[in-house]
């Protein structure tokens, strides 16, 4: 997330400037904290204070976005239901599975569907 | 495996604009970062630009801010680079690259366009 | 921007040989250094990406090391098709920058 900005090396924040290009946000040292991003536009140059969270599980952060399906349906058994994403964009140095699988708990309803069926699949 | 093919050779007088088109076949042409690249004769390589085919984000150098357009056509999978007003200097091979930071990259084969009047 | 400098501009070396390529960028650029293989009339070829993180159908014998400022790529025992030209990359920060190659040629 971009903090205050650090320091501007040419040109000022009031210069007109139609689009900026950042770069990733770099840490300082290491590979995760407090770092800076470089931005360009024309001959004006900035740096803006970021950070990198340490804890980020870099899969399902910001760096990839994915497109997902609909959720499947429940699954009496394990009381969960899964959908799948492929891979929409990733930023340029963030290493994105390119498909994921998500699953989370049914609500109780669905639980309850599910389970019917089952039984009546029984019979 | 993605597969680049770009188009022909092209000779231009200086001042025409030229396209450059980079046709993607095999994975997910929309999921990557399509980078632009050229080598002048006998020397080494120069990035241009970049664009994400999913939105059309484009960074570009700013050396090709007035020189280079890029574009994209998600229903055909084909990456375009435009050229405006060339020059001699811009004689060169240019080359598109589909990039993963997962797996690498792929590249065209170059395209040759040649500015001389 | 971010300048590579790559050293030597020609390596003379017979095959069996190691290769050691040096590229070193003017401020620290964590991982984000690649390093291609270029060939007369060829597009380059991505040997490593992220500084030591090997690509899938590239012989074992390349290898590279950092982060930082200073990268190496090394071959370990040079074979008669490595003779080429070799570029570093870096992808830390916008624009995307070359360094100027490196010949390896056979002496």
């Known amino acids: 997330v971009a903090k205050k900005k650090d320091k501007v090396k040419k040109g000022g924040p009031g210069s007109e400037c139609a689009e900026w290009a950042w770069g990733p946000c770099t840490p300082s040292s290491k590979d995760c904290g407090v770092g800076f991003r470089e931005g360009t536009c024309g001959a004006q140059t900035q740096r803006i204070r970021c950070r990198v969270p340490c804890n980020w599980k870099k899969e399902f952060g910001a760096d990839c976005k994915y497109k997902f399906e609909n959720w499947g349906a429940c699954d009496g058994g394990t009381g969960t239901k899964v959908r799948q994403g492929t891979l929409k964009k990733a930023r340029y140095n963030a290493q994105c599975q390119e498909t994921i699988r998500v699953t989370k708990p049914c609500t109780p309803k669905t639980k309850a569907k599910a389970k019917a069926k089952k039984g009546k699949g029984k019979d | 495996q993605v597969q680049l093919v770009q188009s022909g050779a092209e000779v231009k007088k200086p001042g025409h604009s030229v396209k450059v088109s980079c046709k993607a076949s095999g994975q997910s042409f929309s999921s990557y970062w399509m980078n632009w690249v050229r080598q002048a004769p006998g020397q080494g390589l120069e990035w241009i630009g970049m664009i994400h085919p999913s939105d059309s984000e484009t960074i570009l150098n700013q050396k090709f801010k007035d020189k280079a357009t890029l574009t994209v056509d998600i229903s055909t999978s084909t990456a375009y680079m435009e050229l405006s007003s060339p020059r001699s200097e811009d004689t060169a091979v240019y080359y598109c690259?589909?990039?993963?930071?997962?797996?690498?990259?792929?590249w065209g084969q170059g395209t040759l366009v040649t500015v001389s009047s | 921007e971010i300048v590579l400098t790559q050293s030597p501009a020609t390596l003379s070396l017979s095959p069996g040989e190691r290769a050691t390529l040096s590229c070193r960028a003017s401020e620290s650029i964590s991982n984000n250094l690649h390093w291609y293989q270029q060939k007369p009339g060829q597009a380059p070829r991505l040997l490593i990406k992220y500084a030591s993180q090997s690509i899938s159908g590239i012989p074992a014998r390349f290898s590279g090391s950092g982060p930082g400022t200073d990268f190496t790529l090394t071959i370990s025992s040079v074979e008669p098709e490595d003779f080429a030209v070799y570029y570093c990359q870096q992808s830390n920060s916008w624009p995307l920058t070359f360094g100027g190659g490196t010949k390896l040629e056979i002496k």
């Open positions: 690259s589909s990039w993963s930071a997962k797996r690498g990259d792929f």
